[in-house]
């Protein structure tokens, strides 16, 4: 569909004569008629295939035609068409003398023609007007003609319709040959896909509207490159959705079981060693001078009673020393000046003589010890406390602290390691001699059954169109993350698709 | 009075050349699509080419594409014909001819011969 | 190409009678045809053209009639001068083709 314009620039006539030769009376009040028609190989009479057009009256003998809406009529004047644009045309032009004020065809005389004349053209679509003279003995007519496509109509010949839009069909202007040109943000044949914020993950991001980025169920981030972990996953990650994998020093289905508690919690205090044994467990090696579990207590170094022969022991910073009683000397105090005859033996230790009494030995009475009996016996030092408890006198008695998994009175009963219940879904613990073992139900594994293996929703291929299938292993249930195109939670459903021309 | 006179044509070899022209006159030559007409001794009418009033289209009889070129100038009111590689086939009286019969304009020259032979 | 073909190849009629000769256009050419007059040595004279309008200076005995592929042209009382090759010629598209011509003889 488009327009044949013709602007009539200029007609001379200068004697004011029909084509008959006759004068006109008063002057020639010339109008024109045009025809515009197929292209023939040798232009001949009629119908005017392509359209016709008449002017009012435009002027006397030789007048220039303005480029406006001159006395009611249009230049230039439109010869619109609503078929493909060919290429070629055959145009009539006619000048004729208006008697009076009717210009119908049947109201003139048939000597009233002024001029004729009839062209071949070729003329392309939207070309700058094309200026053409025809002369003859008695008149010259100016003028020049185009051809422009209408609104919405584009191409070489005005047959490729394209209109503008910006709504759920698409986002587009048209360009000059009628191809769509997609607004800023859109892309696709009829610019109705948006273009998604700038590195939006091709599969687990999508968008509605140019620039965003909306993450499919799994998915997560400005860029939906980040996975979503499992539900309540405390210590762990993830690599597809859903998952749970654990960080170094943490176990079980939701990464919560602490199996690196040394690292974790620095439990142990001046500057002993800590070793794992276990979820929550651990063993302190203390270094010298300290004490506790967790090597929190300071040994004096006097309380293992160092000094021998009633010496007695003062701390130092670095260590200790003994101040020997009369008789004795050495660095415990274990050399003695004395012989039998000075009665060392206290509480009623026997002296019996050594060395040609050079020397002598106390046999001492029970509960007490020592070279000279002096000390009363420490129930600690027969290491009384099984498992590595630890031995502390308490006055007349003594008591053991033991180690995490021992019990009894010495250290003696291993506590069941399964008495926390560590086997997770139902799983049945065995004590063993260091440590335990879980025998897990169908569908669990790991070390404490924590790992589900069996139930996976995915197995069954339930996601449509190429999806990717996720398991959400608190539910057993499946998660299905669709192509671009498709919706549903099996993604079973196409994005409605537009009609071939959505106009 | 309206005259087309043509002349160039002549005995000339397969493979030559010849150049054609018609020279017009007594009407308004730039005014009129014209044509190169021949008829072949013993032969009906066959149309050669075409030329529109103002050069800008020209169409050509399949036999001769490629080979003949229609031209005009206006200036002079004078048509032409470029006859390269002839063949025998194209031996005939060779007419230039105004014709539109919107306007009843039909007018004939009385063509010029060209003979290719060897 | 639009294939013109004139029948008869000959026709022979007495003066004074009507002759009529008839032009077949391989497909339709919308009126587009011109009927001439050929004498030897002369250049063709045109009669008719649009189908049916006479060309002017041609006497009035001359006519055409005719649309879509089948035209006629008719000499309704024959004179002397008449007596020549006439062939019709299409004008609706390239290549123009001309029908092969009916030869009107003296009977």
């Known amino acids: 569909s488009g327009v044949f314009q013709l602007q009539l620039q200029e007609f001379i006539n200068e004697r004011g004569v029909l084509a008959s030769g006759r004068p006109c009376e008063p002057g020639c009040r010339t109008f024109f008629r045009v025809c515009l028609k197929h292209f023939q190989a040798v232009v001949s009479p009629g119908p005017c295939t392509f359209g016709t057009v008449s002017t009012p009256v435009l002027g006397t003998n030789s007048f220039a035609v303005r480029d406006d809406s001159s006395g009611g009529g249009r230049n230039p004047l439109q010869l619109p068409f609503n078929f493909t644009w060919p290429g070629t045309f055959s145009l009539i032009i006619e000048a004729w003398h208006a008697p009076g004020d009717d210009l119908r065809p049947e109201a003139l005389p048939p000597d009233a023609l002024i001029s004729k004349i009839a062209i071949q053209g070729s003329l392309a679509v939207g070309q700058n007007w094309l200026l053409d003279e025809q002369t003859s003995t008695l008149t010259r007519l100016r003028y020049s003609y185009r051809v422009i496509c209408s609104d919405n109509y584009y191409g070489d010949n005005c047959s490729r319709l394209c209109k503008k839009r910006n709504d759920h069909f698409g986002h587009y202007v048209c360009q000059p040959d009628g191809n769509l040109s997609c607004l800023p943000g859109w892309t696709g044949e009829y610019c109705q896909q948006p273009i998604c914020l700038s590195g939006c993950h091709e599969q687990n991001g999508y968008c509605s509207k140019p620039a965003e980025c909306l993450c499919r169920p799994g998915w997560q981030g400005r860029l939906c490159n980040e996975c979503i972990p499992h539900n309540g996953c405390r210590h762990g990650t993830c690599s597809t959705p859903w998952q749970c994998t654990c960080d170094e020093g943490w176990g079980g289905l939701f990464c919560d079981q602490d199996l690196n508690y040394c690292t974790h919690h620095s439990p142990c205090k001046n500057g002993a060693t800590c070793s794992n044994s276990g979820q929550r467990s651990y063993t302190c090696t203390c270094r010298p001078g300290y004490t506790g579990v967790d090597c929190e207590l300071e040994l004096s170094e006097c309380d293992s009673n160092p000094c021998r022969n009633g010496g007695s022991c003062k701390d130092q910073e670095d260590g200790y020393h003994c101040l020997c009683p009369p008789g004795y000397y050495g660095l415990h105090c274990e050399h003695s000046t004395l012989s039998c005859a000075d009665s060392p033996c206290f509480n009623g230790g026997s002296c019996r003589e050594r060395n040609q009494g050079a020397n002598y030995a106390c046999e001492c009475p029970p509960n007490f010890t020592g070279s000279n009996c002096e000390k009363k016996v420490d129930r600690c030092t027969s290491n009384p406390c099984a498992n590595g408890g630890q031995c502390l006198n308490r006055g007349p008695s003594r008591m053991c602290r033991c180690r995490p998994g021992f019990t009894g009175t010495y250290c003696e009963l291993h506590v069941s390691d399964c008495a926390r219940n560590p086997c997770a879904h139902g799983g049945t613990c065995h004590d063993l001699e260091n440590g335990l073992m879980c025998t897990c139900p169908a569908g669990f594994s790991g070390r404490r059954c924590e790992v589900r293996t069996s139930i996976d929703a995915c197995a069954s291929s339930p996601c449509f169109n190429r999806a990717t299938c996720y398991t959400d292993l608190s539910t057993d249930t499946f998660v299905c993350n669709c192509p671009y195109g498709f919706v549903g939670s099996r993604c079973e459903f196409p994005v409605g698709l537009p009609p071939s021309f959505p106009w | 009075e309206v005259q087309l006179v043509e002349s160039g044509g002549g005995v000339v070899q397969p493979g030559r050349s010849l150049r054609l022209s018609c020279a017009a006159s007594?009407?308004?030559?730039?005014?009129?699509?014209m044509y190169w007409i021949r008829q072949a001794p013993g032969k009906g009418l066959e149309w050669v080419a075409f030329?529109?009033?103002?050069?800008?289209?020209?169409y050509y009889r399949d036999s001769v594409k490629g080979r003949f070129t229609i031209s005009r100038d206006n200036s002079k009111s004078t048509l032409y014909l470029q006859m390269n590689s002839l063949r025998a086939e194209d031996t005939a009286v060779y007419h230039c001819a105004a014709l539109n019969w919107e306007l009843g304009i039909d007018y004939w020259g009385q063509g010029t011969m060209v003979t290719v032979s060897s | 190409e639009i294939v013109m073909t004139q029948s008869p190849a000959t026709l022979s009629v007495s003066p004074g009678e009507r002759a009529t000769l008839s032009c077949r256009a391989s497909e339709d050419i919308y009126s587009n045809l011109a009927w001439y007059q050929k004498k030897p040595g002369q250049s063709p004279r045109l009669l008719i053209y649009a189908a049916n309008r006479l060309q002017d200076g041609v006497p009035a005995r001359f006519s055409g009639s005719g649309s879509g592929t089948e035209y006629t042209l008719t000499i309704s009382s024959l004179q002397s001068e008449d007596f020549a090759v006439y062939f019709c010629?299409?004008?609706?598209?390239?290549?123009?083709?001309f029908g092969q011509g009916t030869k009107l003889e003296i009977k």
């Open positions: 007594g009407f308004t030559f730039s005014n009129y699509g």
């Open positions: 010629l299409q004008g609706s598209k390239f290549p123009l083709t």
């Open positions: 030329i529109s009033h103002g050069g800008g289209i020209t």
